[in-house]
Interface confidence: low
């Protein structure tokens, strides 16, 4: 079952999935000036059997000006319904990605894809958070969020991460006025998770997935 909302946003933090549960959909979004080819799928779907999971369909974008070259389009409004976004760049690379049963890895980038990847997560998905450059974690706790089913509704658990500037007083979440989310709906937190395209993230994941260490490179 799809999660009803986006993962919570944490001020001055970004989130990332290490792997995507089967059933996850990724919208085939194209950057400005490009659109999805007419015969192309509107999304990629993580599917699998007992031994292997992979992304069905491929995203292809074509130049809005050109008629016959292969390449993709921003989904129509109906395709954007209940859209999920990581608001992280496609250039982001996940190093040493683990293989988890029933999960797909981060899909490789496609030509002329949009800078923002929009996922439709499913119940049971976990995403991990880290503070952005220039901010540090104010206190420890599970810096992750899991989409869970509660009372027949889906809800993301709340990551215990507060990111504060080295020279700033600590900011308690929610004291800023939240900004509108990319799709125009109010969001659950106050942060801007969109990052620049030179942001890269590497992860080292213990085999048990009990500990998750983010190492970030900025170039």
């Amino acid at each position: 079952e799809l999660c009803d909302d986006d993962p919570p946003k944490i001020t001055h933090a970004t989130f990332k999935a290490v792997a995507y549960k089967e059933g996850t959909m990724l919208n085939c979004e194209c950057k400005r000036g490009f659109r999805r080819i007419k015969s192309g799928s509107p999304y990629m779907l993580c599917t699998g059997n007992s031994s292997h999971s992979s992304w069905d369909n491929q995203c292809q974008c074509t130049s809005s000006a050109a008629r016959n070259t292969t390449k993709q389009v921003t989904p129509q409004p109906e395709e954007q319904k209940e859209r999920k976004t990581t608001e992280m760049q496609s250039q982001m690379q996940l190093a040493d990605q683990v293989s988890l049963p029933g999960h797909c890895r981060e899909p490789p980038p496609w030509e002329n894809e949009a800078t923002e990847r929009i996922y439709h997560f499913v119940v049971g998905q976990t995403v991990y958070y880290q503070c952005v450059q220039g901010y540090r974690a104010l206190h420890r706790g599970p810096a992750e969020s899991v989409c869970k089913m509660t009372h027949g509704k889906t809800r993301w658990t709340q990551p215990q991460l507060i990111c504060t500037g080295e020279t700033e007083p600590s900011q308690f979440p929610g004291e800023e006025e939240p900004q509108a989310s990319p799709d125009g709906l109010p969001e659950s937190e106050t942060s801007r998770l969109v990052t620049t395209t030179d942001f890269r993230i590497q992860t080292e994941v213990a085999a048990t997935m009990e500990t998750f260490i983010f190492t970030t490179e900025y170039q």
């Epitope: 009803d4 889906t154 709340q158 215990q160 979440p173 709906l185 109010p186 659950s188």
Partner: antibody
């Protein structure tokens, strides 16, 4: 300054209805997780219902199907519609803002609901 | 549901005393715990979140510790305004649950 002010409590007979309101200032209700928490001498503090920014709602088992949480974004107000009230619903009802981590950082002053014949 | 049990249910102390209140969760909740102070006729007030993080504006004589199932709220030097009822609350999973409260009285 963040402020929450509840109203709408009172005496009602079993089976009756009440609508509680919580007027918020200093922040935007629609952009936050909002909850109703009630307090009774017997059961203590109990989370009754919550609604968060995406509009998802949830209810305690004891009130599901009878209570409805909602909000009016234009009035920056949270509501709790309580139907089929029972004696055990007698409590002080607080609206509270969730700090996004299931902690309640701001509370209203509370409004007393008494269900009695 | 996760049950939260506080002890003692009431405690008498004097101004200047160091007071400790404990809270035990029926299952592990990592550090997903908050402490609230409530005075008669008033709403609860958040003191500590994430087990040990002090809420903005709360005096530093309040501190929290613990992880997993056992947690402690400590008031290092009681002030007259600290006499109240204190509640713990787990924030790990739904339904969110509170302890039954510990009443701190003047000796």
């Amino acid at each position: 300054e963040v402020q929450l002010v509840e109203s709408g409590g009172g005496l009602v007979q079993p089976g009756g209805s009440l609508r509680l309101s919580c007027a918020a200032s200093g922040f935007t209700v629609s952009s936050n997780y909002m909850s109703w928490v009630r307090q009774t001498p017997g059961k203590g503090l109990e989370l009754v219902s919550f609604i968060y920014s995406g509009g998802i709602t949830s209810y305690a088992d004891s009130v599901r199907g009878r209570f409805t949480i909602s909000r009016d974004n234009s009035k920056n107000t949270l509501y709790l519609q309580m139907n089929s009230l029972r004696a055990e619903d007698t409590a002080v009802y607080y609206c509270a803002r969730d700090d996004y981590s299931n902690y309640f950082d701001y509370w209203g002053q509370g409004t007393l609901v008494t269900v009695s014949s | 549901d996760i049950q939260m049990t506080q002890s003692p249910s009431s405690v008498s102390a004097s101004v200047g005393d160091r007071v400790t209140i404990t809270c035990r969760a029926s299952q592990g909740i990592s550090n997903w715990l908050a402490w609230y102070q409530q005075k008669p006729g008033k709403a609860p007030k958040l003191l500590i979140f994430a087990a040990s993080s002090l809420q903005s504006g709360v005096p530093s004589r309040f501190s929290g510790s613990g992880s997993g199932t056992d947690f402690t709220l400590t008031i290092s030097s009681l002030q007259p305004e600290d006499f109240a009822t204190y509640y713990c609350q787990q924030a790990k999973s739904f339904p969110i649950t509170f302890g039954q409260g510990t009443r701190l009285e003047i000796k």
